[in-house]
Interface confidence: low
Amino acid sequence: VPRWRQQWSGPGTTKRFPETVLARCVKYTEIHPEMRHVDCQSVWDAFKGAFISKHPCNITEEDYQPLMKLGTQTVPCNKILLWSRIKDLAHQFTQVQRDMFTLEDTLLGYLADDLTWCGEFNTSKINYQSCPDWRKDCSNNPVSVFWKTVSRRFAEAACDVVHVMLNGSRSKIFDKNSTFGSVEVHNLQPEKVQTLEAWVIHGGREDSRDLCQDPTIKELESIISKRNIQFSCKNIYRPDKFLQCVKNPEDSSCTSEI
């Protein structure tokens, strides 16, 4: 008799999830010498232990602490790039500017990027059929709690000038409900962080508006200023050209504003 299984509103665990996490861990530790000491089997065991046999709407940050401990990593605190709703460009940028880091350039972020996972209460099974949706089901699900935990730690580690890439094509360029708006902004440490510098990425070819004057950016500035952190904002009118010029600063087309 097939056992009754909870149907959630979100997609199920990514297929081959355990193999993917393990393979990513091995690849990451091979590429990053400072993480060569990490035992990937232990990392997987800690990851699995955070959500297996637990109700997928009842996950806590505490569940992820063994994984956090194993994945402890020091990145240069003044080289942190946050992003909101513009992940691909942020990752393209750090691939070119190798001394800058997004969360997904760290081991834990790299392991989980674009993956979904959840388990079931009281069974050791991974649920490949469905997982809780943050809005429709519950916020304390394995994926959301993981990203909240690692995002908080990443923001807490930042110092000096912190950069954030924001999507100028969205109706809310700064969204208080995004991970950046709800977690990272509030966990920057004013005693360490001098300035948050926002880069508003334009989408339109001929879009010459100053999106730094957008009401949501002004809201971000207000939140940051109240936290005793300076705020600055720059428009990146031509993201394609911006990336090209980061790669080849001497290119003749890089002598004007981007």
Epitope: K234, C245, V246, P249, C254, T255, S256, E257, I258
Partner: nanobody, 115 residues
């Protein structure tokens, strides 16, 4: 915000030398010199990265030398064997990723080379 102030421009005879300075009010990464002759577009002269790597426009190679003093947040352009075609307003630029990265520009200093 970083302020950039150029100095050292002036009138010089062909074959002569000038040394331009660009003082930055804060820490910068990549810096560069650009120039704009009347009726022409702004062109790259030379850049220097945070690590000290330099690049030059073909037209100034062997004659101009870019350098920086990180302790003083100042960049220099030593211009030797000047030619009339070097006459332009010279601008200093600074940015985190490349000099013209929509970041900081100086007001410019006039260099005039007479024949």
């Amino acid at each position: 915000e970083v302020q950039l102030v150029e100095s050292g421009g002036g009138l010089v005879q062909a074959g002569g030398s000038l040394r331009l300075s660009c003082a930055a009010s804060g820490r910068t990464y990549a810096m560069g010199w650009y120039r704009q002759a009347p009726g022409k577009q702004r062109d790259l002269v030379a850049t220097i990265s945070g690590a000290g790597n330099t690049k030059y426009a073909d037209s100034v190679k062997g004659r101009f030398t870019i350098s920086r003093d990180n302790a003083k947040n100042t960049m220099y352009l030593q211009m030797n064997s000047l030619k009339p075609e070097d006459t332009a307003v010279y601008y200093c630029a600074a940015g985190k990723w490349f000099p013209a990265a929509n970041e900081y520009w100086g007001q410019g200093t006039q260099v005039t080379v007479s024949s």
